[in-house]
């Protein structure tokens, strides 16, 4: 049987059940190569409390549909009077990056995971030439996830003192220049994730090969190498390589630019101080507030919730958007869709789409940007579920009793962007990270 998601085959992936201190290793096309789980384990469970290993999915006993992958075992469950077997179930949803498998829950018999990934999309519009896993768990099983830094088009400019060259990078993925035909970036060779531009020439100095690595709790490393055998004439016979070290800052701060810290014989070392290198619980919340010792900040957007069936309305030219954030109040137009953001076509108000649901909510504060994300909305033709990204700005003189109002700024591939100036986005900082 052919592998259902070949892009995911090259790596062994990890997921964590934080509540029970369990680390899962997943290889969807082969085996995870952990002796304690046996030679054919596709999903290996490591219980760190009991220091035991169990195979909870066998690569030989795999069944697949377009959106679901199941690995059975021959091990009976502990449920009395049943002949169920232990199994793992991975539900796949379309995402804009390779993404990460997320542990959902485990019953006596079944270990459930969800994975938003380009590999599950109906169309190839989000697929990269080359992309590698962009997250890692540290020794405390805390997740560090650089997926939000991945640019689907364009690149980051590396701060370099050399006026004659420009070094562009993407994170975990090659640089896509198709959306900007006029810039210097257009000359970059396909597949490159690190592109050096000198005058009118552009050179591939690195492509992603291995996934993100953790070197210390707050330092992550990504390595790019030039795959082609042909040497560049300005590299003195060496093969180009790029090492990007992502550093979690010691306290809250605005984002910084990736900086070139060393350069020798086409070996480029880059340091990027960014809060995205910190563990995810430091940056994100599933509620509308971020506070406490762990986050170093106090943010509470819950006063923005609307009661009594009213919603914020944002005009998007062809569409009206109805928003009801930080609550579970149904939007009238989007009845029964559990939408936090509802898109209604002006010319035909029967055309209604959920652009993100209130139980699929993430509040993120990273590198000085405060963002509320609603995902899991109605599907677009690509298979991607509509989502909304609301970028908040602190404004102590905002109207509407300080609440302000969301403004639609545009749509990119079924992701809807809004900005919202409000006094409730004014962040209070603590200092003890």
């Amino acid at each position: 049987q052919a592998a259902p998601f070949p892009e995911l085959c090259s790596y062994t992936w990890e997921a964590v059940d934080t509540k029970n201190n369990v680390l899962y290793k997943i290889n969807i096309c082969g085996s995870v190569d952990i002796v304690q789980c046996g030679p054919s384990s596709a999903v290996c469970m490591h219980d760190l409390k009991t220091r035991t290993y169990h195979s909870v999915g066998d690569s030989v006993l795999r069944s697949a549909t377009r959106s679901l992958l199941e690995f059975n075992t021959t091990v009976s469950c502990d449920q009395q009077g049943t002949n169920h077997r232990v199994q793992s179930s991975i539900a796949f949803l379309c995402g804009k990056t390779l993404g990460t498998p997320e542990f959902v829950t485990a019953t006596f018999c079944v270990h459930y995971f969800e994975w938003r990934t380009t590999a599950a999309c109906k169309k190839d519009i989000f697929k990269a030439n080359k992309e590698v896993p962009c997250y890692v768990f540290d020794e405390e099983l805390r997740k560090h996830d650089l997926n939000p830094l991945i640019k689907l088009s364009g690149a980051y400019l590396v701060d370099d003192s050399d006026p004659d060259t420009s070094l562009f990078i993407n994170v975990c993925r090659d640089i896509d220049t198709l959306r900007d035909p006029g810039s210097q970036l257009r000359a970059c060779p396909p597949g490159t994730a690190a592109c050096l531009v000198r005058g009118h020439q552009a050179f591939d100095v690195g492509q992603p090969r291995d996934g993100l690595k953790v070197v210390r709790k707050d330092r992550l490393v990504l390595s790019y190498v030039r795959e082609e055998a042909g040497k560049l004439d300005f590299c003195d016979g060496h093969s180009p390589a790029v090492t990007i070290t992502f550093v979690c800052p010691s306290e809250r701060r605005e984002g910084t630019i990736p900086k070139l810290t060393a350069k020798s014989n086409c070996r480029y070392e880059i340091e990027w101080i960014t809060e995205y290198a910190c563990h995810r619980d430091y940056l994100e919340s599933k509620t509308c507030s971020l506070s406490g010792e762990q986050q170093d900040v106090s943010i509470d957007l819950t006063p923005l919730a609307q009661s009594g069936g009213s919603s914020y309305i944002s005009d998007g030219k062809e569409y009206l958007f109805y928003l009801n954030v930080c609550g579970e109040t149904e939007i009238q137009f989007c009845n029964k869709k559990q939408a936090a953001v509802c898109q209604v076509k002006k010319s035909d108000t029967s055309q209604v789409k959920a652009a993100g649901r209130y139980h699929n909510q993430t509040l993120r504060y990273s590198d000085g940007d405060l963002t509320l994300i609603y995902f899991g909305g109605d599907e677009c033709s690509s298979g991607f579920q509509r989502m909304s990204v609301i970028n908040f700005e602190c404004n102590k003189t905002a109207g509407n009793d300080g609440k302000g109002t969301p403004v639609f700024t545009g749509e990119v591939d079924c992701t809807y962007f809004f900005t919202w100036d409000t006094e409730y986005a004014c962040v209070h900082h603590h200092h003890h990270h």
Partner: nanobody
Framework: QVQLQESGGGLVQAGGSLRLSCEAS????????WGWFRQAPGKEREFVAA????????SYADSVKGRFTISRDNAKNTIYLQMNSLKPEDTAVYYC????????????????WGQGTQVTVSS
């Protein structure tokens, strides 16, 4: 690709003010960063100010810091350059530009450009 159209240029006395506008049409991707550049006769095009579309992070050339302010109105797909305390050396054609490169002020990294609007500051 995005199309850009500047307006608001003109003749002004030293110490005066002008507000330039740049309207974006086509697909105004949120991945774009937006910049103002200027080019005086016989000189190279130089960076003036930049802003992220998805947030209000800004950067300025040292020569205009404290005098110029870049802003955006997302509802109108428009960016602005408010120019105060104008000096004769601010005389130039001002261009609006869009880039898919983060953290750049280099004009060659901007792929979409407007036609420009003339600003003349007399002494």
């Amino acid at each position: 690709q995005v199309q850009l159209q500047e307006s608001g240029g003109g003749l002004v006395q030293a110490g005066g003010s002008l507000r330039l506008s740049c309207e974006a049409s086509g697909r105004t991707f949120n991945t774009y960063n937006w910049g103002w550049f200027r080019q005086a006769p016989g000189k190279e095009r130089e960076f003036v100010a930049a802003i992220r579309w998805s947030s209000s992070k800004t950067s300025y050339a040292d020569s205009v810091k404290g005098r110029f302010t870049i802003s955006r109105d997302n509802a109108k797909n428009t960016i602005y350059l408010q120019m105060n305390s104008l000096k004769p050396e601010d005389t130039a054609v001002y261009y609006c530009a869009a880039s898919i490169v983060d953290f750049t002020t280099n004009p060659s990294h901007f792929g979409s450009w407007g036609q420009g609007t003339q600003v003349t500051v007399s002494s």
